[in-house]
Amino acid sequence: SERCDDWGLDTMRQIQVFEDEPARIKCPLFEHFLKFNYSTAHSAGLTLIWYWTRQDRDLEEPINFRLPENRISKEKDVLWFRPTLLNDTGNYTCMLRNTTYCSKVAFPLEVVQKDSCFNSPMKLPVHKLYIEYGIQRITCPNVDGYFPSSVKPTITWYMGCYKIQNFNNVIPEGMNLSFLIALISNNGNYTCVVTYPENGRTFHLTRTLTVKVVGSPKNAVPPVIHSPNDHVVYEKEPGEELLIPCTVYFSFLMDSRNEVWWTIDGKKPDDITIDVTINESISHSRTEDETRTQILSIKKVTSEDLKRSYVCHARSAKGEVAKAAKVKQKVPAPRYTVELACGFGAT
């Protein structure tokens, strides 16, 4: 057979589906690899072929589309399972071809078991809600295309193992779950179970996501440098170790990059000849505010080093700040004999 453009195994699209539930999987070729869609390909005379490799096997085999009740079927560029079974786990390949053209991609499909509280090895999407920010909603994800708009499914929402009813600030509204005012206690896993009929059968779709309550933009402030500050003076003798912490508090900001850095005499530590080490530690609050500490360390400080300017800088999407550390050379205590001699006017 002629050469086929093989995009390999697309591990970026590790698809996980629950056992005994419907699953519709679009061929990734049209979504991520080719510049045309299925309709264009179909009208150009290209055919989409599906096959798979079972888990722990090397042999590629065609997918059996003649199972009872059409358990596995193909519709346009979608592979359907009604429903999945545990042993459907494997690598699936979709190939688009005619006599002159061929392109294919494989992707892993994992059929996952869940317990009665919806716990499973499924990787969960995270939805961030702002704390105390007014009404915010989450929507039951990835249910489009499973049933026509004429079908009215029933949707039940759960938090963890518990059905959401009479919760203090969480209200189920069909496909949406409304948080009247999000609080830390709203952190957790939320599951929607969508139940719909099809050809005399009842199917369930289970979708779980993690809600993380984060700092509100109304509370967000520019970075705050807690150290160095005006109250602490780093007074050292030559030969001692100089340790200056730069501690910065960053409000949570969606998609903001938080940066902390030191300059010594206006230059980055990498650009100067002093033997400086910088160690960083990061801690997060319950609402994902961040405290970064960068400790500047000079093992054996010289009198020249003690004359330099040490400035801590911080930047986030809210702004940039800087603070200089107060560094000075410790004045040695006067030696008694010298002081006495001076007192008597000796030269």
Epitope: M159, N187, G188, R286, T291
Partner: antibody
Framework: EVQLVESGGGLVQPGGSLRLSCAAS?????????MCWVRQAPGKGLELVSC????????WSASWAKGRFTISRDNSKNTLYLQMNSLRAEDTAVYFC????????????WGQGTLVTVSS | DIQMTQSPSSLSASVGDRVTITCQAS??????LAWYQQKPGQAPKLLIY???TLASGVPSRFSGSGSGTDFTLTISSLQPEDFATYYC??????????FGQGTKVVIK
């Protein structure tokens, strides 16, 4: 009315055990709250003992409480518990049950406390 | 573990006085600090959260300030019902949940 009522305190001998209860009313444990036990020895300050998220059951305990004190909850009874084993004289205190100490705001709530006396 | 140090441990003041209590955290806790008032035989009552936000129903003579490691509770004009013990509480994350040792405000 939203309230917390502790019970189960009393006199116990050193080495003995006791189980404290905190009955919650006016709100539903399954809705997920951060419930804690806080103690206060006579004439002393507040000390955090142990906390639990009522929905998931995830817990946190002070390092000194691990191994001797166990927090739990029964969501069907809307009740928080503290099982205290191998009790010592220094565990003598009023034990308070409190809600939402992880982000105290307008939802913060405390019970009136129950006295535990460990003495022979 | 984090240490929360309050000062003074006790203070005597008169009605109408301006009273200031400080709380120092052994590590930076951002704005995640609450203040409570406790009267003998009663449960603590929340006064201030997020370092400076007044809890509902708390008189405006109470105010809080600070961030990072240094925090202050101020009572602008002490009233007879304010004689009590005051506690700070850090709640930055589960590794920093702790109360200060308390400050007792007594009548001079």
């Amino acid at each position: 009315e939203v309230q917390l009522v502790e019970s189960g305190g009393g006199l116990v001998q050193p080495g003995g055990s006791l189980r404290l209860s905190c009955a919650a009313s006016g709100f539903d444990f399954s809705s997920n709250y951060y419930m804690c036990w806080v103690r206060q020895a006579p004439g002393k300050g507040l000390e955090l003992v142990s906390c639990i998220y009522t929905n998931s059951g995830n817990t946190w305990s002070a390092s000194w409480a691990k191994g001797r004190f166990t927090i739990s909850r029964d969501n069907s009874k809307n009740t928080l518990y503290l099982q205290m084993n191998s009790l010592r004289a220094e565990d003598t205190a009023v034990y308070f049950c409190a809600r939402d100490l992880n982000y105290p705001d307008t939802s913060n709530l405390w019970g009136q406390g129950t006295l535990v006396t460990v003495s022979s | 573990d984090i240490q929360m140090t309050q000062s003074p441990s006790s203070l005597s003041a008169s009605v109408g006085d301006r009273v200031t209590i400080t709380c120092q955290a052994s590590q930076s806790i951002g704005y995640y600090l609450a203040w409570y008032q406790q009267k003998p035989g009663q449960a603590p009552k929340l006064l201030i959260y997020r370092a400076s936000t007044l809890a509902s129903g708390v008189p405006s003579r109470f105010s809080g300030s600070g961030s990072g490691t240094d925090f202050t509770l101020t009572i602008s004009s002490l009233q007879p019902e304010d004689f009590a013990t005051y506690y700070c509480q850090s709640y930055y994350n589960s590794d920093s949940d702790a109360f200060g040792q308390g400050t007792k405000v007594v009548i001079k």
